[in-house]
Structures are given as structure tokens and as C-alpha cells.
């Protein structure tokens, strides 16, 4: 049994770092395989991972954690059965991708704007809390060529944008990921999208 | 063997400043979250606060946003805290804690005392 | 602010029987990563606290096996199954779920 690429693995930076990794051939890998790891400080113990298939060759592991510190490096060891196939190390600081924005609304009873919210994936005594900025993608639901990216790079999970700029009754969605500069970040998967009516309409001596 | 060893006792006029320290041994500070804790004489604990020493992120109860400021030094393992306007109130033993992630090392206390 | 409230007090108990103190969160206290940091904490008196009990349940090392934790939601409850004259002091119970996080006003164990 080989390991064919080895285990890579990125940090939501609050309780779970997904590692994933290649075999040399089809493994059932909750069977045959552990990821073991244990934090690099006093006393911590060994944890286990019960990696599950991700594709014929390919294993992930969601590695479970308290809480994470800049400075927190794991030792990992891939073992099938009594055979060691890989020993390596992760610093979930160097890795992170942050959790996905939640709860995405659209909210249209201002006749000329558009407001759109969100929530921070994080709570306030997370680091990331206070370093996300944001991506909103708003689409035109009849036409994929009608689609524009905002970058809100305050720190208000909210993006306010004028009717008007969008078709009149058409159907539009958004949505909206995040990353954290700080920490030079890959961008967070998509939120689930949201859809809304743009019933808004030029005044009459502007048509 | 893991030890947090705070500064010794003070005694301050009301309105003035003190800053306390707590030296950790054993282990790096930048390896956990650093918390300050408050014990008025005869009471509980109240939580005050923390830092990561790496990064310097802290975070406050309200209550003691803006009476305390939270630092650390990493070169010299040591996390500290400062306390503003001092008013009689103020009077307690406060406790370094290291937290990674539940309150495993505590700091001997430090008591500071306000009094005209 | 969640708080955190201790019944009883103080406890007063003859060596060999029983403790029990409960605790009770004003909301839920599960983490956004589904842990739920209840601890509890023992100060001796003239003593920093300690550490007992961790995420509900778990004794922290050297802790003697006849402290247990239990509980879910917003009631946790400490017991001691044979109260010894060492376990004298306040007991504490905690949240580190939420910022800011808080302790109970805690209960005072006697021996009679």
C-alpha cells in the first residue's frame, strides 16, 4: 500500500482542518487507513481520524479541533494498520480557508435599494471575526453574461446597491464568500444563493 | 514543569495606574491564549480578558473595556496587564490563566490594593 | 452576557457522602464548532482554583475519579461521590463558549 500524493490539508481556523491525500490504487479508506495527530504542545493527546473515500484512489479526513493559536503546528501519521505510509506536519495557520458565510438575505423594501446581509462565519473571540472582507456575486437568473462580483471590504457584513443598476423585472441571486487578509487566505466556498424579484421601476420622467 | 509566576503585590492611589506581570515557564506562551481574571476580596471570579501573545488580538469583557489593556511579550515569555484609573473598586487579587483550550495553569494571583 | 447560576450556595456534608451542585446557563452555551466548554473549578482556600472538570464530562488529569460532570444544554451538574476533607473550598462552574465568558457565582463546600 502507497501513498501516491500526499496528505494536504487546509484550517477553518476554529475546529476542523480537511485533509485529503491520493492512494497508489482503490482503497476503501475508513477500512484500512488512520490519520493520527496530536497538537505540538505539553500533554496533548494523540487524536484519530476515520478518513472516508473521496473518489476510487482518494481519501479526506476532517481533523477535529478546540481551538487553534497562530503558532499551532500538528504532527500527522497516515497508518494502514501497523505500517506507517506517510509522517508529516500541518500549521493550520499557513492553510486556512474560512468557513462560509451564512444566511444571506436580500432585502428590497426600500423602493430604490437593494440591501443584501449576511453573517460572519465567526464568533468574536475568533481572530478571523474582525479580518474578513467579502465577494458578493449577484446574477441575472435568464442571462449568465448579466453577473458582477462586489468586493465588500469593510468589516459590516452588508452590501447596499442601487436598483436601478440591475434589470427591472428580472429575477436575480446572490451570493457571497469570504477571505481574511491577514493571514493570506484562500476564498471560502460559496454561501448557499439566494434569489429576489427587482420589481423596482425608473421614475416616469426618466423613461 | 509549567509555571506562571506573577508580580508582587501593589499598593496604588486611586486615579493611578498599575501594571502587573505573569511569567510563564515550561512552555511558550505563543502556544496559548493568555486570560486575566479578577477576584474582589470575598467574591468570585470574573473573567477580564485575553491575548494571543502571537498575533497581540485581545479581547475584553465589557465591563473591563477600557480600565484594562492586555500585552505580552514573547521574547520574554511574559503576558501583562494594565490597569487605568484605579478606584477603590478596583481592589482584588487578579489571576494570570493560560487557557489551551480550558484554564489548565494558574498564576499565583496578584493582589492590588486602592487606597487613599 | 450569559449567566451562569449556582445552586446551592454553600454545602455543608459529612465525609464519605455525597455532593452534588448544579449549574444553569441563562441560554445555550454550544460553541459554533458544537463543543460546549462547561468546566468547573475548585479553589481551595488560600489557593489559586483548579481545574476539575472539562467540556462537561472529562476529568482533567490527577483529578480523582470521584468527581464526575454531566449535563447538556443549559443545566450541568457536579457531583462528588465520597466528599473527602480535602475537597473543602468554592466550587466554580464555567463557560467558554461565548464571549465574554463567564463563571458562576459559586458554592462554598463545608464539612460538617
Known amino acids: 500500500m502507497k501513498v501516491l500524493q500526499e496528505p494536504t490539508c487546509v484550517s477553518d481556523y476554529m475546529s476542523i482542518s480537511t485533509c485529503e491525500w491520493k492512494m497508489g490504487g482503490p482503497t476503501n479508506c475508513s477500512a484500512e487507513l488512520r490519520l493520527l495527530y496530536q497538537l505540538v504542545f505539553q500533554s496533548s493527546e494523540t487524536h484519530t481520524c476515520v478518513p472516508e473515500n473521496n473518489g476510487g484512489v482518494g481519501c479526506v479526513c476532517h481533523l477535529l479541533m478546540d481551538d487553534v493559536v497562530s503558532m499551532d503546528n500538528y504532527t500527522l501519521d497516515l497508518w494502514a494498520g501497523q505500517q506507517l505510509l506517510w509522517k508529516g506536519s500541518f500549521k493550520p495557520s499557513e492553510h486556512v480557508k474560512p468557513r462560509a458565510p451564512g444566511n444571506l438575505t436580500v432585502h428590497t423594501n426600500v423602493s430604490d435599494t437593494v440591501l443584501l446581509t449576511w453573517s460572519n462565519p465567526y464568533p468574536p473571540d475568533n481572530y478571523l471575526y474582525n479580518d474578513l472582507t467579502y465577494a458578493v456575486n449577484i446574477w441575472n437568473e435568464n442571462d449568465l453574461a448579466d453577473s458582477r462580483i462586489h468586493n465588500v471590504t469593510y468589516l459590516k457584513p452588508t452590501l447596499r446597491i442601487p436598483a436601478s443598476t440591475l434589470k427591472s423585472g428580472i429575477s436575480y441571486r446572490a451570493r457571497v464568500r469570504a477571505w481574511a487578509q491577514h493571514y493570506n487566505t484562500t476564498w471560502s466556498e460559496w454561501s448557499p444563493s439566494t434569489k429576489w424579484y427587482n420589481s423596482y421601476r425608473e421614475p416616469f420622467e426618466q423613461r | 514543569e509549567v509555571q506562571l509566576v506573577q508580580s508582587g503585590a501593589e499598593v496604588k492611589k486611586p486615579g493611578a495606574t498599575v501594571k502587573i506581570s505573569c511569567k510563564a515557564s515550561?512552555?511558550?506562551?505563543?502556544?496559548?491564549?493568555m486570560h486575566w481574571v479578577k477576584q474582589a476580596p470575598g467574591k468570585g471570579l470574573e473573567w477580564m480578558g485575553r491575548?494571543?501573545?502571537?498575533?497581540?488580538?485581545?479581547i475584553y469583557a465589557s465591563k473591563f473595556q477600557g480600565k484594562a489593556t492586555i500585552t505580552a511579550d514573547t521574547s520574554s515569555n511574559t503576558a501583562y496587564m494594565e490597569l487605568s484609573s484605579l478606584r477603590s473598586e478596583d481592589t482584588a487579587v487578579y489571576h494570570c490563566?493560560?487557557?489551551?483550550?480550558?484554564?489548565?495553569?494558574w498564576g499565583q494571583g496578584t493582589l492590588v490594593t486602592v487606597s487613599s | 452576557d450569559i449567566v451562569m447560576t449556582q445552586t446551592p450556595l454553600s454545602l455543608s456534608v459529612t465525609p464519605g457522602q455525597p455532593a452534588s451542585i448544579s449549574c444553569r446557563s441563562s441560554?445555550?452555551?454550544?460553541?459554533?464548532?458544537?463543543?460546549?466548554?462547561l468546566e468547573w473549578y475548585l479553589q481551595k482556600p488560600g489557593q489559586s482554583p483548579q481545574l476539575l472538570i472539562y467540556?462537561?464530562?472529562n476529568r482533567f488529569s490527577g483529578v480523582p475519579d470521584r468527581f464526575s460532570g454531566s449535563g447538556s444544554g443549559t443545566d450541568f451538574t457536579l457531583k462528588i461521590s465520597r466528599v473527602e476533607a480535602e475537597d473543602v473550598g468554592v466550587y466554580y462552574c464555567?463557560?467558554?463558549?461565548?464571549?465574554?465568558?463567564?463563571f458562576g457565582q459559586g458554592t462554598k463546600l463545608e464539612i460538617k
Open positions: 464555567f463557560q467558554g463558549s461565548h464571549v465574554p465568558y463567564t
Open positions: 441560554q445555550s452555551i454550544v460553541h459554533s464548532n458544537g463543543n460546549t466548554y
Open positions: 515550561g512552555f511558550n506562551i505563543k502556544d496559548t491564549y
Open positions: 490563566v493560560s487557557r489551551r483550550p480550558w484554564f489548565a495553569y
Open positions: 467540556k462537561v464530562t
Open positions: 491575548i494571543d501573545p502571537t498575533n497581540g488580538y485581545t
